[in-house]
């Protein structure tokens, strides 16, 4: 059985609920015959605030005046202490400290949609720390009133559950919220509004887009709205953009023509609605419609470059390369490229459609004047063709750019600089900087990269398809009319010492000297552009320093003579390779003994 307060009572004056800062009187009194047996005057009553003693008194009752109680609930417990026994709980009381409610602020009401219900929100002000009841009252024309109550401590929202109708859109309604607790009450300022002020339309729905004759220039957006909507705002953007285009329209009646959309672009569209020019609020944005605009024929022209390779006395190989159009130029999916090759004097022409590649290689006679035209086609048409006359790009020595250099510029960039050609520099119409990975075999399958530079530029930063620790063959062409001059250099963006030395594969004797042949270091072990090879030799079983011969690196070279060996002496030979960062480890060692006669 619970025996709380069987032995006595705790009373609280003026009230269990007090204003912050108030004083409270707590009295603990024993009921008759409930004190310590035989020693009633020895009764020791102790008052605890939670678990801390705050007062005690011998006798049948105890009075305590308490101040400075914090906001919230404080527990007081009265206990009786008798000699030679544990303290006995007599009774307890909770005191609730709080404040009167502040005036509710910023009362605002809204009805979501023409069929929605009126709901209001407000700011409660500071926490009262007490149970506080909120009453929301709405009064309208013809003395109509509605009332809703909220008994939640944290109440700042109530829905009346009634629907305002547009019969008299200018009729005034007044809302007011009142907060009441044990310490006082307070009412908000009244909020007066009309139907048009508080109805927030539902967002538009069923959004569609139509392109007349599959053309981006004839595009209409359609949607559905609530009946009283007067204004709409549209926003749209390419799906990959963060910036919206905005359009405000009046009396659109669920349709609007858009005139500035880009072709072959996925757009996101949203619409919002409002009932009145200057009253009320905009609806939420509608759900997004995503749609791709139709293709249009490509604009712009392809950037085309080429490479010539001598095959034999009568034939040459032409490799054409071109860059993809930008998305804004392609204006659709490029289906194929059309390449036309024409001999200008004889008028012969051949045309080929190329899909899936941005290059084309053919063999043509070395005689005649040849031209090519390349265009890109999508489902709507073709770009304007880029025309190029095939010429010997390096033929005009006086047009060759001078003092070409290539220097690493940060990660995976190479800065190429040059001086204008000696011949009248103003004759240069443009420079082309071309680069490709250096392969000792001169492999024509290696991808070609290029960029065009204006005639007044004397430098270019190349970064496309540049990898660390790879050597690139870089050419700078100066073009003038039907003439061209070029200069080349090797360059890398990052280098270190080669991982291995060349492999000597043969040593042969020729007229008292030897010819050393070697295999090139694999490209992936060169670690940048090679500058030199070194050939080392010393007498077998000798502790002397080896002699060495340093040879400048040339792509095609893989043999070199040495004529300083003594006959009938066995030598050990090996090779290393050097980049600007240092020397490789030894390649393989070979022994050789020259058989020739002694001098």
């Amino acid at each position: 059985k619970i025996d709380a307060c069987k032995r006595g009572d705790v009373t609280v004056k003026p009230s269990h609920v007090i204003l912050l800062g108030s004083t409270v009187n707590i009295t603990c009194s024993l009921k008759p015959r409930q004190g310590c047996f035989h020693y009633s005057r020895r009764n020791k009553l102790i008052l605890y605030k939670f678990d801390r003693r705050i007062n005690f008194h011998h006798g049948h009752s105890l009075n305590s005046q308490v101040t400075g109680l914090p906001l919230g609930t404080t527990l007081f417990v009265c206990k009786l202490a008798c000699i030679n026994s544990d303290e006995i709980q007599i009774c307890g009381a909770e005191i609730f400290v709080g404040v009167a409610p502040e005036q509710p602020q910023n009362l605002s009401c809204i009805q979501k949609g023409e069929q929605g219900t009126v709901a209001c929100t407000w700011e409660r002000g500071r926490d009262t720390h007490l149970y506080t009841e909120y009453t929301l009252q709405l009064s309208g024309p013809k003395n109509l009133t509605w009332q809703k109550q909220c008994k939640d401590i944290y109440c700042d929202y109530l829905d009346f559950g009634i629907n305002l109708t547009p019969e008299s859109p200018e009729s005034n309604f007044t809302a007011k919220v009142t907060a009441v607790n044990s310490l006082g009450s307070s009412s908000s300022l009244p909020s007066t509004f009309t139907f048009l002020d508080i109805v927030r339309p539902l967002p538009p729905w069923d959004i569609r887009i139509k392109f007349q004759k599959a053309s981006v220039s004839r595009c209409t957006l359609y949607w559905r709205d609530e009946g009283l909507v007067l204004l709409n705002r549209l926003r749209y953007r390419p799906s990959n953009s963060r910036l919206w285009n905005m359009v405000n329209v009046t009396k659109a009646k669920g349709r609007h023509d858009l005139l500035d959309l880009k072709p072959f672009t996925e757009y996101e569209f949203q619409i919002s609605s409002k009932l009145h020019l200057y009253k009320g609020s905009w609806s939420d944005w509608s759900e997004s419609l995503r749609a791709q605009t139709p293709e249009e024929e490509p604009t712009g022209m392809l950037d085309v470059w080429y490479m010539k390779r001598h095959i034999d006395y009568s034939r040459q190989q032409i490799s054409l390369f071109w860059k993809n159009l930008s998305v804004s130029e392609a204006r659709g999916k490029i289906l194929h490229y059309q390449v036309t090759l024409q001999e200008l004097t004889g008028g012969k022409a051949m045309t080929q459609n190329i899909t899936g590649h941005t290059s084309w290689t053919t063999v043509i006679p070395r005689t005649g004047n040849w031209a090519v035209a390349v265009s890109a086609a999508n489902s709507k048409g073709s770009s304007l063709p880029t025309r190029i006359n095939i010429m010997n790009l390096c033929e005009a020595g006086l047009l060759a750019p001078r003092q070409v250099s290539a220097n690493s510029e940060g990660m995976d960039n190479i800065l190429v600089t040059w001086q204008p050609p000696r011949k009248d520099p103003s004759a240069v119409q443009e420079y082309v900087v071309e680069w490709r990975e250096l392969h000792p075999g001169g492999d024509t399958q290696v991808p070609l990269n290029w960029l065009r530079s204006r005639p007044y530029n004397v430098s270019a930063l190349i970064s496309e398809n540049i990898k660390s620790y790879i050597c690139y063959e870089i050419r700078v062409y100066a073009l003038s009319g039907d003439q061209g001059g070029c200069s080349s250099i090797l360059g890398n963006s990052k280098h270190k010492a080669p991982l291995s030395g060349p492999h000597i594969n043969a040593i042969t004797e020729e007229k008292g000297s030897i010819l050393i042949s070697w295999n090139s270091i694999p490209v992936q072990e060169q670690m940048g552009c090679l500058l030199h090879y070194r050939i080392y030799w010393k007498e077998r079983d000798s502790n002397s320093q080896p002699q060495l011969c340093e040879i400048p690196y040339r792509v095609s070279q893989n043999s070199h003579p040495i004529n300083s060996l003594q006959p009938r002496v066995t030598y050990v030979l090996w090779m290393t390779a050097l980049t600007a960062a240092g020397e490789s480890s030894h390649g393989n060692e070979r022994e050789f003994c020259l058989q020739g006669k002694a001098n």
Epitope: I2, V12, H16, V17, C91, E94
Partner: nanobody, 125 residues
Amino acid sequence: QVQLQESGGGLVQTGGSLRLSCVASGRTFNWSAMGWFRQPPGKEREVVATISGGGTSAYYADSVKGRFTISRDGAKNTLYLQMNSLKPEDTAVYYCAADRVDYRMTLTQNGNHYWGQGTQVTVSS
């Protein structure tokens, strides 16, 4: 009128847990003691746990001490009983009760309280 509506009862194995809830409507019980009572089959109603209006003081019957926890949420006008390590002898109809008088610290066995309809808790072995 005042209503107390219990929920959360059910069938559970020995050693299992349940959480009972009691939602009060019709008046606020923020100042009133509330509690849980139970009536095992064929026995009298007995107190399980009570809690003061401000939630600062709780009482538990000896048979449930250390296993059951009573709590309340004034904002939601809701009383809870978390029951862990349930035993077959906890099988009973559990009733929610609220004091008709504000500011008292606890409910008494035979006091004049508001009562709920009860929710069945069955603990099977």
